[in-house]
Amino acid sequence: AGLLLIVSPSHPTEGSPVNLTCKMPSLQSSDAQFQFCFFRDDQALGPGWSSSPKLQIANMWKEDSGSYWCEAQTMASKVLRSWRSQINVHRVPVADVSLETQPPGGQVMEGDRLVLICSVAMGTGDITFLWYKGAIGLNLQTKTQRSLTAEYEIPTARESDAEQYYCVAENGYGPRPSGLVSITVRIPVSRPILMVRAPRAQAVVGDVLKLHCEALRGSHPILYWFYHEDVILGSSSAPSGGGASFNLSLTAEHSGNYSCEANNGLGAQRSEEVTLNFTVPTGARSNHLTS
């Protein structure tokens, strides 16, 4: 009777251990008189010849599938060989692919680091992760690694990074996409520009002046405050672009310095001051406004 190779478990899953035992036929005496060696496809495994009839392979991978056997050598150099056992390592297909962001929620400040973390709930072996930008995906990066998560990093987030993203994971059983994730890049307001619009070149008392304040950059909504000599005249919100306006009905007291402030919750910026002067002419001539 020859040797018997016992494989446990007989149908291993990738990443799990396998125990090989070289069993002596019952008519042989003590195992201690023998040296054992385990083989796969003509390659000796582990330590080669050893007095132990057992060998544990800590992590089996798909490429470890093959024909296994063991040999035992007596003191008299007589070699016994087991029958070959075919071991097929089972790969678990990727499932439940998800995309998460760091910072969480997909909101990142302009200039900050953004990480897109692609994860699979299950899946073994080499997993290829791909990241895509836009509903019609532009492939950003591809990584192949033996782990359930992988990261794509945008070191410095820019306005152009605000888009939909998704990732795809694949380990030989077909690609599996994650759901979509939307990235919002939050931009602090730039210094606003205050413009004064009068109905005529020489505005007079009673005319309505339009103060228009606009920050050319910054995430919306933006709240604009209007000031006369640092006293708040009023405020106006701009849910989308174009800035905000404030109407002022002119009186003689309206000479002085005007400014505006833009605030979108990510910081406030004050405009340069605009000086508006009235000349108070003699007689029946009206007050004129110059800036």
């Epitope: 997909g106 895509y132 509903a135 019609i136 995906g137 532009l138 492939n139 939909q164 998704y166 795809v168 690609p175 996409p177 994650s178 759901g179 979509l180 994730v181 939307s182 919002t184």
Partner: antibody
Framework: QVQLQQSGPELVKPGASVRISCKAS????????IHWVKQRPGQGLEWIGW????????KYNEKFKGKTTLTADKSSSTAYMQLSSLTSEDSAVYFC????????????WGQGTTLTVSS | DVLMTQTPLSLPVSLGDQASISCRSS???????????LEWYLQKPGQSPKLLIY???NRFSGVPDRFSGSGSGTDFTLKISRVEADDLGVYYC?????????FGGGTKLEIK
């Protein structure tokens, strides 16, 4: 199973507005874009635009800008399309459809909502 | 806008025959990422459209292998090798490469 259930038929007067709903079930609503398509009686299909329910961000066909407003309510997994200043040209069947990214196709469609604009 | 022109407008066939529908785009619909987002949908009376083919030649799951798509650039074809009664309806090609996305005018497959 995945389903897109649209609101019932609408008969409205010219100049009025209408809101059509598309309730999604059987999947994570925020994971896919919802698109809207118009079909005039006896005619072909026209793509209106899409909305991403995750952030409510819409993208429109220029032709339908100003006419159409797309919104989504995550809490009820429902997408909406509002049509304003209605004319007889807006009389049509309107479909919502889910589009799968990466594979890139409309895999599930609503049953359609018939809008009739008539005085 | 990309104009999608389908021919013929109407296609009378006998059951068991082969049917061929052409779809031409007014410009190349190869996306900048290298993919061609050309799809075919079938709409039966009173129903919503159903997907048959995506990315020119990929059959959607559950679609019989009697349906096949081919083509590149601006010229695309849908072939039905042996027409069955269940195949009757209006076929639309669709391009999702350039916004605004556009459908063809439709081809009505009917019994001769």
């Amino acid at each position: 199973q995945v389903q897109l259930q649209q609101s019932g038929p609408e008969l409205v007067k010219p100049g009025a507005s209408v809101r059509i709903s598309c309730k999604a079930s059987g999947y994570t609503f925020t994971s896919y874009n919802i698109h809207w398509v118009k079909q005039r009686p006896g005619q072909g299909l026209e793509w209106i635009g899409w909305i991403y329910p995750g952030d409510g961000n819409p993208k429109y066909n220029e032709k339908f800008k100003g006419k159409t407003t797309l919104t989504a309510d995550k809490s009820s997994s429902t997408a909406y399309m509002q049509l304003s200043s209605l004319t007889s040209e807006d009389s049509a069947v309107y479909f919502c459809a889910r589009r799968i990214h990466y594979y890139d196709y409309f895999d599930y469609w609503g049953q359609g909502t018939t809008l009739t604009v008539s005085s | 806008d990309v104009l999608m022109t389908q021919t013929p407008l109407s296609l009378p066939v006998s059951l068991g025959d082969q049917a061929s529908i052409s779809c031409r785009s007014s410009q190349s619909i190869v996306h900048s990422n290298g993919n061609t987002y050309l799809e075919w949908y079938l709409q039966k009376p009173g129903q919503s459209p159903k997907l048959l083919i995506y990315k020119v030649s990929n059959r959607f799951s559950g679609v019989p292998d009697r349906f096949s798509g081919s083509g590149s650039g601006t010229d695309f074809t849908l072939k039905i090798s042996r027409v069955e009664a269940d195949d009757l309806g209006v076929y639309y090609c669709f391009q999702g490469s350039h916004v605004p996305w556009t459908f063809g005018g439709g081809t009505k497959l009917e019994i001769k």
